[in-house]
């Protein structure tokens, strides 16, 4: 309830997160023209990436372009990229949709198609669909510990969401354990009314809202957080127009003195932690 006699002050906050969990990934691996099932283990260092501000990212799916080398090769024949003669290819041209710089030559991509040759990381990335179901769909069972320190400078009051009495093995539950600051990712989605398995394919953005409504008067002191969750990206975006959340990164290595890279298009959930609230004192 609004106490008009109190002096209110907005919260100043800092957030630190720690994600835990292991995923086993089974995918098709092609070596020397032979495709077989490959098994790999993903730990925190493999699927989380440091982000700026009050955010963390968990990779739930990926598409790899392995063994790329800087050389010349045909551009991937995406829509509008095919050619029939060199006239269609402009030397030095960098098409924003392309993955390289055109050499001016129209060359065979495969048996039936020709595309402009580019100087690029080759072979250029194919336009592949994100795997369905998501490769790291078991990320649903990962947990995140959220440490949230807050401060009201005008009232000279500081506290945090983690209490000394808290059990390190607890898991947040809206009813049974609303003060536990360890959250199962699947539960976050369930609370927000979203399907983790579905969002994991293309990625998305999930908001974790921490609301502090603090009464700092000594006779009726109360200052504990309330957690709520909601999806922040537009899930209704037309499928053809950049759905979900993804980015690319590369792992570089040398093989026979040739610099190579594996390009990874990572799909996943960016969790934005939004802290707001006020502290009131007479």
């Amino acid at each position: 309830s609004d106490k008009l006699y109190q002096r209110k002050e907005p919260v100043i906050s800092s957030v630190h997160t720690k994600v835990k969990g292991i995923a086993e990934v089974t995918e098709n691996v092609t070596e020397g023209g032979v495709t077989k099932l490959g098994h790999s283990i993903f730990d925190t260092a493999d699927y989380t990436f440091p982000l700026q501000g009050n955010s963390f990212f968990v990779m739930t799916n990926y598409v790899k372009s392995e063994g790329q080398v800087q050389t010349l090769c045909p551009e991937y024949p995406r829509r509008g990229a095919q050619c029939s003669s060199d006239r269609r290819c402009k030397k030095g041209w960098m098409d924003p949709q392309s993955k390289g710089i055109q050499t001016g030559r129209c060359v065979p991509y495969d048996k039936t198609r020709k595309t402009c040759e580019v100087s690029a990381w080759c072979p250029t990335e194919e336009e592949k669909e994100a795997p369905r179901p998501a490769l790291l769909r078991s990320a649903e069972n990962f947990t995140v510990l959220i440490k949230n320190n807050i401060h009201f400078p005008g009232h000279n009051y500081t506290t945090r969401n983690i209490l000394p009495t808290m059990n390190g093995s607890c898991t947040f539950h809206k009813t049974w354990d609303p003060q536990c600051s360890i959250f199962r990712l699947g539960d976050i989605f369930q609370e927000a009314g979203e399907n983790f398995t579905e969002v994991a394919v293309q990625g998305g953005i999930m908001g974790i809202e921490i609301y502090w409504d603090c009464n700092l008067d000594s006779w009726s002191h109360h200052c504990r957080p309330r957690y709520s969750f909601r999806r922040l990206d537009d899930k209704n975006t037309d499928e053809s127009f950049v759905p979900g959340y993804n980015f690319r990164y590369a792992k570089y290595y040398k093989e026979n003195n040739v610099e190579k890279r594996t390009l990874i298009k990572a799909f996943g959930i960016r969790f934005d932690i939004l802290v707001f609230g006020t502290g009131g004192k007479f």
Epitope: G33, G67, T71, C73, Y109, P123
Partner: nanobody, 115 residues
């Protein structure tokens, strides 16, 4: 799938020359040669992009082997000179998407260099 047929292998004396040829069933961006000596892994020898641009050679054959292409005929040749006994191997023709990346290989042709 691209079909590749190699020819030109044989027995030659050290210091001699040999020319290998390969015909592909369809046009392809890059064509190249690999070799495999007994008890060793298959290794890259030489590769050529479309119209012979770019070309790439293994350090061990630079200055001795020359790769050339005929796009119109979908063929690639490997002119080998100054042959050494360590060049003895089965030579495979290959096609791919760049001079570093190959998907299809032929059956191979034997080259033996005697000392």
């Amino acid at each position: 799938e691209v079909q590749l047929v190699e020819s030109g292998g044989g027995l030659v004396q050290a210091g001699g020359s040999l020319r290998l040829s390969c015909a592909a069933s369809e046009r392809t961006y890059s064509m190249g040669w690999f070799r495999q000596a007994p008890g060793k892994e298959r290794e890259f020898v030489a590769g050529s992009g479309w119209d012979g641009i770019p070309t790439r050679y293994a350090d061990s054959v630079k200055g001795r082997f020359t790769i050339s292409r005929d796009n119109a005929k979908n063929t690639v040749s490997l002119q080998m000179s100054g042959l050494k006994p360590e060049d003895t191997a089965i030579y495979y023709c290959a096609t791919g998407t760049s001079v570093y990346h190959y998907q299809y290989w032929g059956q191979g042709t034997q080259v033996t260099v005697s000392s």
